[in-house]
């Protein structure tokens, strides 16, 4: 009679994470009697998953039936399985002793190894906004994926980039991996509508990649240029005067006007024109009283545009051109929220 | 621990036989339980075991198809049940116990390791 | 099958060995039984190979290796003269026993 064996058919075994894993093992005899336990690992530091005799493990089920009497498979299921369950497990067969049980035989080990997907990406860009023309930050992150090996690209408006660092942690061994990138990104004034995309790739995902996105509207911000210009009159003793704002982002602006320097009205910007670029447009205009200036007027539009050091345009207005009303002082009548008088 | 046999005496061929086992000190729960028996002048013979899951039972050839083993936890009671007696089932027959305290169904119904031994229960098959 | 002796003597104070032989190593567990005489209950001296239940005099020990396994009496004595049987199993037979040894004590 040959003396028993503990087989372990499978070398490895490959499970999805949240799937149930089959451990497989058999004896080749009935005698020593004596309980099967599982492990996960060896030596002393090994993890007891399943035994036989005692205990509760409401994660694993036997494959058969362990009452029946000539059973000789101790195989066992492990339910929602993660990545913390890889390993290798071994099928050890005890004999019964006194007052212990004695440990007999044990299986080759099998390996279980955990696929578990990533994590969305997570994309981040930089804390503060930044101008065209200057490279900013972006990362990505995901988590809790293994086997280790994953792929990952960046993409700006479909196009792929190549200024990026990538590292897997941890470099050795592990249940579970993460992922972490960064790319420099170019803006430019075009970029209000533009999207940065972290695409992560594992064999996990079935050729579907996992991506992230951030909108580059949230890091840009494109500076207004100005442009201060007299109407023509209105009226033989008014002139408009109008500050064009364009090309901006974002929508928080500012705008102040000066009559030599000093403070005539002050507006937030609120009903705005949309370029299809995702810059705004808006114009402010003051219509001005020339009776009321014996000289001639410096006219200033000064902005502050998302709590940036102001900018401005100045215009001269030349009075002695126009007729007036000695010793006038008659207010002329608004005609917009964003009219004003200068007197 | 003690084991306590009974039921043997003078028995006709062809009538059927029951043997009883108290076991007291343990819980017959725990442990896989046996018959064994000692015709005259030979050694001893496994006749018939139990496990200590009550489910799993096993018989020597001499007696399989004949013999039924059971038990009965409430009554800590062991019986053989012997139908068909011939004159070879004579013999003295003893209850046994294994030392192994079992909780598990793959002890299944092995009788390896005895520890304690009723006195014996004499049975005479005869015409 | 399991083989013993069918007879050893010794005086007392000897030490005597009694052998038990199984056909294969698949006999993980031996034990003696001493019967004083036929039909009286048997007595287990050593289970577990080696191990001795309460009640039995230290003179007797236990040993296996292999398919063989040996019962000593270390210094005999008179009281311990009876047939002394060897048990074990395998995996169809849940109990199995030799024919028995005679031990004499001169």
């Known amino acids: 009679e040959e003396e028993l064996q503990v087989i372990q058919p499978d070398k490895s075994v490959l499970v999805a994470a949240g799937e149930t894993a089959t451990l497989r093992c058999t004896a080749t005899s009935l005698i020593p009697v004596g309980p099967i336990q599982w492990f996960r690992g060896a030596g002393p530091g090994r993890e007891l998953i399943y035994n036989q005799k005692e205990g509760h493990f409401p994660r694993v089920t036997t494959v058969s039936d362990l009452t029946k009497r000539n059973n000789m498979d101790f195989s066992i299921r492990i339910g929602n399985i993660t990545p913390a369950d890889a390993g290798t497990y071994y099928c050890v067969k005890f004999r019964k002793g006194s007052p212990d049980d004695v440990e007999f035989k044990s299986g080759a080990g099998t390996e279980l190894s955990v696929r578990a997907k990533p994590s969305a990406p997570v994309v981040s860009g930089p804390a503060a906004r930044a101008t065209p023309q200057h490279t900013v930050s972006f990362t990505c992150e995901s988590h809790g994926f293994s086997p280790r090996d994953i792929t990952l690209k960046w993409f700006k408006n479909g196009n792929e980039l190549s200024d990026f660092q990538t590292n897997v942690d941890p470099v050795g061994e592990s249940v579970s991996y993460s992922i972490h990138s960064t790319a420099k990104v170019v803006l430019t004034r075009e970029d209000v509508h533009s999207q940065v995309i972290c695409e992560v790739a594992h064999v996990t995902l079935q050729g579907d990649p996992l991506r992230g996105t951030a909108n580059l509207s949230e890091t840009i911000r494109v500076p207004p240029t100005l442009e201060v210009t007299q109407q023509p009159v209105r009226a033989e003793n008014q002139v408009n005067v109008t500050c064009q704002v364009r090309k901006f982002y974002p929508q928080r602006l500012q705008l102040t006007w000066l009559e030599n320097g000093n403070v005539s009205r002050t507006e937030t910007a609120s009903t705005v024109t949309e370029n299809k670029d995702g810059t705004y447009n808006w114009m402010s205009w003051l219509l001005v009283n020339v009776s009321a200036h014996r000289d001639d007027v410096k006219l200033t539009c000064q902005v502050e545009h998302d709590g940036q050091p102001a900018v401005s345009k100045s215009h001269d207005l030349k009075v002695s051109a126009h007729p007036k009303e000695q010793g006038s002082n008659t207010a002329a009548e608004n005609t917009g929220s964003n009219e004003r008088n200068i007197y | 621990v003690t084991l306590d046999e009974s039921g043997g005496g003078l028995q006709t061929p062809g009538r059927a036989l029951s043997l009883v086992c108290r076991g007291s000190?343990?819980?017959?729960?725990?442990?896989?339980m046996g018959w064994v028996r000692q015709a005259p002048g030979k050694g001893l013979e496994f006749i018939a075991s139990?496990?200590?899951?009550?489910?799993?039972?096993h018989y020597a050839p001499a007696v399989k198809g004949r013999a039924t083993i059971t038990r009965d936890v409430g009554q800590s009671t062991v019986r053989l049940q012997l139908n068909n007696l011939r004159a070879e089932d004579t013999g003295t027959y003893f209850c046994?116990?294994?030392?192994?305290?079992?909780?598990?169904?793959?002890?299944?119904?092995?009788?390896?390791?005895?520890?304690?031994w009723g006195h014996g229960t004499e049975v005479i098959v005869s015409s | 099958a399991l083989t013993q002796p069918s007879s050893v003597s010794a005086n007392p104070g000897e030490t005597v060995k009694i052998t038990c032989s199984g056909d294969?190593?698949?006999?993980?567990?031996y034990g003696w039984y001493q019967q004083k005489s036929p039909g009286s209950a048997p007595v287990t001296v050593i289970?577990?190979?080696?191990k001795r239940p309460s009640g039995i005099p230290s003179r007797f020990s236990g040993s296996a290796s292999g398919s063989t396994a040996t019962l000593i009496i270390t210094g005999v004595q008179v009281e311990d003269e009876a047939v002394y049987f060897c048990?074990?199993?395998?995996?169809?037979?849940?109990?199995?026993f030799g024919a028995g040894t005679t031990l004499t004590v001169l």
């Open positions: 046994a116990k294994d030392a192994y305290q079992c909780s598990y169904a793959t002890c299944n119904d092995y009788l390896d390791t005895i520890d304690a």
């Open positions: 000190g343990f819980s017959i729960s725990s442990y896989n």
């Open positions: 139990i496990g200590s899951d009550g489910s799993s039972t």
């Open positions: 294969n190593s698949a006999h993980y567990y």
């Open positions: 289970y577990y190979n080696d």
């Open positions: 048990g074990s199993a395998d995996s169809s037979n849940p109990a199995i």
